[in-house]
Interface confidence: medium
């Protein structure tokens, strides 16, 4: 008799998920000598242990603690770049500015970037058919809890000036419901972090508005100020030029506003 399987609203586990995590881990430890000590088989076992045989709507941060322990990594706390709804540009930036780090530059972020996963209660199977959607099904699903956990830890580690890249093309430039707005903002440590500097990335070539005056940015400023952290904001009018100038700062065109 075929067993009834829960149908969730979200896409299922990414194909060949175990092989992908293991292969990414091996590559990461090859690229980053400081992580060469990591045993990738143990990392995969800990990752698997966080969600296999568990109800995919009942995952807790505690479930991920063994993985967090194995993936412990020290990044320069004053070189952290957070982002919201503009991942690709943030990654392009840290590729050029090699001394700055997004969450996806860390082992755990790199392992999980763009992947989906979930299991089933009381079976050791990975569910490749469907996984819970955060809105339609439940928020305590394996993927959401993972990102909440690693994002919280990443924000807690930050110090001095923390940068965040925000998408100026969206109706809510700062969104309280994003991972940045709901997790990272509230886990910056005022005793360590002096300033949060927002970079608002403009989408249109002719867009010369000061998006730092946007009501949602003012809301972010208010939240940050109440946490005794200073706030500053910059418009990045030309993201393409911005990246080129990070790459070639001595270029004569890079003295003007970007």
């Amino acid at each position: 008799v075929p067993r009834w399987r829960q149908q969730w609203s979200g896409p299922g586990t990414t194909k060949r998920f175990p092989e992908t995590v293991l292969a990414r881990c091996v590559k990461y430890t090859e690229i980053h000598p400081e992580m060469r000590h990591v045993d990738c088989q143990s990392v995969w076992d800990a990752f698997k242990g966080a969600f296999i045989s568990k109800h995919p709507c009942n995952i807790t941060e505690e479930d991920y603690q063994p993985l967090m322990k194995l993936g412990t990594q020290t990044v320069p706390c004053n070189k952290i770049l957070l982002w919201s709804r503009i991942k690709d540009l943030a990654h392009q930036f840290t590729q050029v500015q090699r001394d700055m780090f997004t969450l996806e530059d860390t082992l755990l972020g790199y392992l999980a970037d763009d992947l989906t996963w979930c299991g089933e209660f009381n079976t050791s199977k990975i569910n490749y058919q469907s996984c819970p959607d955060w809105r339609k099904d439940c928020s305590n699903n394996p993927v959401s809890v993972f990102w909440k956990t690693v994002s919280r830890r990443f924000a807690e580690a930050a110090c001095d000036v923390v940068h965040v890249m925000l998408n100026g093309s969206r109706s809510k430039i700062f969104d309280k419901n994003s991972t940045f707005g709901s997790v990272e903002v509230h886990n910056l440590q005022p005793e360590k972090v002096q300033t949060l500097e927002a970079w608002v990335i403009h989408g249109g070539r002719e867009d010369s508005r000061d998006l730092c005056q946007d009501p949602t940015i003012k809301e972010l400023e208010s939240i940050i100020s109440k946490r005794n952290i200073q706030f500053s904001c910059k418009n990045i009018y030309r993201p393409d030029k911005f990246l080129q100038c990070v790459k070639n700062p001595e270029d004569s065109s890079c003295t003007s506003e970007i």
Epitope: R16, K27, Y28, H91, Q95, D113, D240, L243, Q244
Partner: nanobody, 124 residues
Framework: QVQLVESGGGEVQPGGSLRLSCTAS????????IGWFRRAPGKEREGIAC??????HTNYGDSVMGRFTISRDDRAVYLQMNNLEAGDTAIYYC???????????????????WGQGTQVTVSS
């Protein structure tokens, strides 16, 4: 000096096939997700295919889906192009992404340096 070398281009009739290769000097190609891009005369550079570091996951632009196949081994990344059309005429480039995944095919301005590319001409 980080350098990428694209090869395998040429002139081919509509419906024909070519296999492009991308090799690297100065860095480990197998540490990166790799994208193939192209620039047709008078057009913007376009992302057409990407393969992640594991070789498991691939992503294609709408214009080449079902006709082009990206693959990799330890030495190179390949783009097998079948059923070529006049609209595929362009200079083809490969480029590394820093990240393990390739969810997007947008042109990454941050790629360290573009190679010379390899010319593909589809003409009867």
């Amino acid at each position: 000096q980080v350098q990428l070398v694209e090869s395998g281009g040429g002139e081919v009739q509509p419906g024909g096939s070519l296999r492009l290769s991308c090799t690297a000097s100065g860095f480990r190609l197998d540490y990166y997700a790799i994208g193939w891009f192209r620039r047709a005369p008078g057009k913007e550079r376009e992302g057409i295919a990407c393969i992640d570091i594991t070789g498991i996951h691939t992503n294609y632009g709408d214009s080449v889906m079902g006709r082009f196949t990206i693959s990799r081994d330890d030495r190179a990344v390949y783009l097998q192009m079948n059923n070529l059309e006049a609209g595929d005429t362009a200079i083809y480039y490969c480029a590394p992404a820093r990240f393990s995944a390739c969810s997007a095919l947008d042109v990454k301005l941050s790629f360290t340096s573009w190679g010379q590319g390899t010319q593909v001409t589809v003409s009867s």
